[in-house]
């Protein structure tokens, strides 16, 4: 009982004057509170509270549920308590079966005893199963059994409070421990697509997925550099214990160009925060941009292959592609494919495969592509490099020797004189006249060159060589002639092709 100091308010006194009282079930509980400023008795057990304004608390026939703490309070707010155990062999425990534990914290299994003199007050697993090896607990007959430092692994653990009574083990009703997980990592956030490209008026919708151990994770969509509240829709579900998922869907029903920008999905819990962004680009209309992967002027040797390759950006996606040459459309020899299989891909590749090109196949090759908004085209000028071909080699009536050669690039014609029977024609002869003629073939075809020399300059028997050459190769033609007295015999031309 409290000691009284004169002049100071003192706590009330209780009879019987002990901290604990044990009564048998069915017996009377009689508690007297003595204090000039008596206010009330309060009874507490588990979550139950009762009050009594009489200074004497009387329970005529005590029951196990009358076990608990009886507190008398005076007008000064000072109090004194006595704990009463109502011993009932048929009801050794009072129980509140709700059992929650915050991860890493202690939690109380609320199974206070009605008889403090039983032994081995402890916890046991249900159906004879052992408790987890690392589970530690502290029993308190007036409150229950405190589990120390709850682990996530204890979630849904089934257990009983247990005592030994007269050599036998007695179990309480079962408890199921619900563990509230602590946040030990930031939320996991992901976005349905990292970038979006839309035309004005189209709907923009993007979904952020937030995963965490519980639904108390916070999440929101934010527009970078803006405080405007965005329209979000949510769905959520539990994939099992400590595995919660939320989907936050952001929608702009009719996107405008000024909606373009970066949108951030932000999530946080007590451990920290995480975010992921998506970029929206809204264009007023679709577009196609073509990028040649090779020079648009192409030189290729006769008989060789060449690939005309373009990359192009198309939004919306391309609907028609074609390659054209001389107003004819290729039905094969080309392929068109997306640059990547990514859902956001707007880049494509088109390749035209030209094989064993002939000199007559030079010209303009055009790639055309269109989508629902625009058309675009790009032209390649293809030049086929051909070795010179000597078209004519004649002695004209005016005594001129004339050589006409065709090839690409434009051939150069050189003249040489070989005296007598020598094989090597080394002495060069300057032409009297050189002309580039217009070809009757298509542009980009062979170029024709005509060169003439005056045969009267030759005074000895011999051979005249007309040599036509360019970057690809060379070809020669020969004029043989002999003198009979002062007259030249008929010239016999022949050609020798030199690769």
């Amino acid at each position: 009982q409290p000691s009284v100091s004169p002049g100071e308010p003192s706590p009330p006194s209780i009879h019987p004057g002990k901290s604990d009282l044990i009564v048998r079930v069915g017996d009377e509980i009689r508690l007297l509170c003595t204090d000039p400023g008596f206010v009330k008795w309060t009874f507490e057990i588990l979550d139950e509270t009762n009050e009594n304004k009489q200074n004497e608390w009387i329970t005529e026939k005590a029951e196990a549920t009358n076990t608990g703490k009886y507190t008398c309070t005076n007008k000064h707010g000072l109090s004194n308590s006595i704990y009463v155990f109502v011993r009932d062999p048929a009801k050794l425990f009072l129980v509140d079966r709700s059992l929650y534990g915050k991860e890493d914290n202690d939690t109380l299994v609320r199974c206070p005893l009605t008889d403090p003199e039983v032994t081995n007050y402890s916890l046991k697993g249900c159906q004879g199963k052992p408790l987890p090896k690392d589970l530690r607990f502290i029993p308190d007959p007036k409150a229950g059994i405190m589990i120390k430092s709850v682990k996530r692994a204890y979630h849904r653990l089934c257990l009983h409070c247990s005592v030994d009574q007269e050599g036998k083990s007695v179990l309480s009703e079962k408890f199921i421990l619900k563990v509230r997980p602590a946040f030990k990592a930031v939320p996991v956030v992901s976005v349905s697509k990292a970038s979006y490209l839309l035309r004005e008026g189209e709907e923009f919708t993007v979904t952020c997925t937030i995963k965490d151990v519980s639904s108390s994770v916070y999440s929101t969509w934010k527009r970078e550099n803006s405080q405007t509240k965005l329209q979000e829709k949510y769905n959520s579900w539990h994939h099992g214990d400590f595995n919660y998922e939320r989907q936050a869907t952001l929608t702009i029903s009719s996107a405008r160009v000024n909606d373009s920008g970066v949108f951030m999905c932000y999530a946080n819990n007590t451990f920290g925060s995480a975010n992921v962004t998506t970029t929206l680009e809204v264009v007023d209309k679709g577009f196609i941009n073509i990028f040649p992967m090779i020079n648009t002027t192409v030189f290729v040797n006769d008989g060789e292959n060449v690939d005309l390759i373009v990359e192009y950006e198309a939004f919306p996606k391309p609907e028609h592609q074609q390659w054209i040459y001389m107003n004819r459309t290729f039905t094969d020899k080309w392929e068109d494919y997306p640059k990547s299989e990514n859902e956001s891909n707007i880049r494509y590749v088109s390749e035209l495969h030209l094989t064993r090109l002939k000199g007559t196949e030079g010209g303009t090759y055009t790639f055309l592509v269109s989508n629902s908004d625009v058309n675009a085209a790009i032209a390649f000028n293809v030049y086929v490099n051909t070795k010179p071909e000597i078209l004519t080699y004649d002695r004209l009536v005016n005594g001129m020797l004339q050589c006409v050669a065709a090839g690409f690039p434009e051939p150069t014609i050189d003249w040489y004189f070989c005296p007598g029977t020598e094989q090597r024609c080394s002495a060069s002869v300057l032409p009297v006249d050189v002309q580039t003629l217009n070809s009757s073939g298509p542009p980009f075809g062979k170029l024709v060159v005509q060169s003439s020399i005056d045969s009267s300059a030759f005074k000895h028997n011999g051979t005249v060589e007309c040599k036509a050459y360019n970057d690809v190769g060379k070809t020669s033609a020969y004029f043989n002639f002999a003198f009979k007295g002062n007259n030249k015999e008929q010239i016999h031309p022949h050609t020798l092709f030199t690769p």
């Epitope: 999440s219 949510y234 919660y244």
Partner: antibody, heavy 119, light 107 residues
Framework: EVQLLESGGGLVQPGGSLRLSCAAS????????MSWVRQAPGKGLEWVSA????????YYADSVKGRFTISRDNSKNTLYLQMNSLRAEDTAVYYC????????????WGQGTLVTVSS | DIQMTQSPSSLSASVGDRVTITCRAS??????LNWYQQKPGKAPKLLIY???TLQRGVPSRFSGSGSGTDFTLTISSLQPEDFATYYC?????????FGGGTKVEIK
Amino acid sequence: EVQLLESGGGLVQPGGSLRLSCAASGFTFSDYPMSWVRQAPGKGLEWVSAIGGSGGDTYYADSVKGRFTISRDNSKNTLYLQMNSLRAEDTAVYYCARGAYDGEGFDYWGQGTLVTVSS
Amino acid sequence: DIQMTQSPSSLSASVGDRVTITCRASQTISGYLNWYQQKPGKAPKLLIYDASTLQRGVPSRFSGSGSGTDFTLTISSLQPEDFATYYCQQNYRTPFTFGGGTKVEIK
């Protein structure tokens, strides 16, 4: 002691609007998700909408999506339901309910407020 | 959306009877099922959450079982105060949905 008290119900014409409030006490309001559940006369329970403890995440039944808006003011311990474009089939007693921890049901309910949509 | 189907829609029983109500989900809901009791003119009251955990203050004659799609609410010995309508409800994913209810009447 946990208490939830709804208000704002009444008679409204089709197409009209109404705002329900739910005043909460006896617990840390911002720690709990909250829901609105309705019950048409003589019918079963229908979940209407829910909101997370912070007010960040909101959820709706398909039948009210786009017409109803749930919100909360944690500084005032109050939950709201703004109901627009009301229809006759929205006539019901509207209950405010506290969401227990993840998936553990609605552990406390208000007494309900009657909304009647009729011309 | 997940549909919840309760059966029977109503039943008559006497005090002391064992009563069983079933609830089936249209897709798996793990153990995220709750049971409520509602008396005329009153708000519903949570009886069982997580399929089998008794809410604080609910008598132990009520019990719940099941997982996945099939769930059961059992009243081991019906008491006069148990005559009411019982609802199941899934909290597995939004939108949350209730069963149609089972009315338990006095025989």
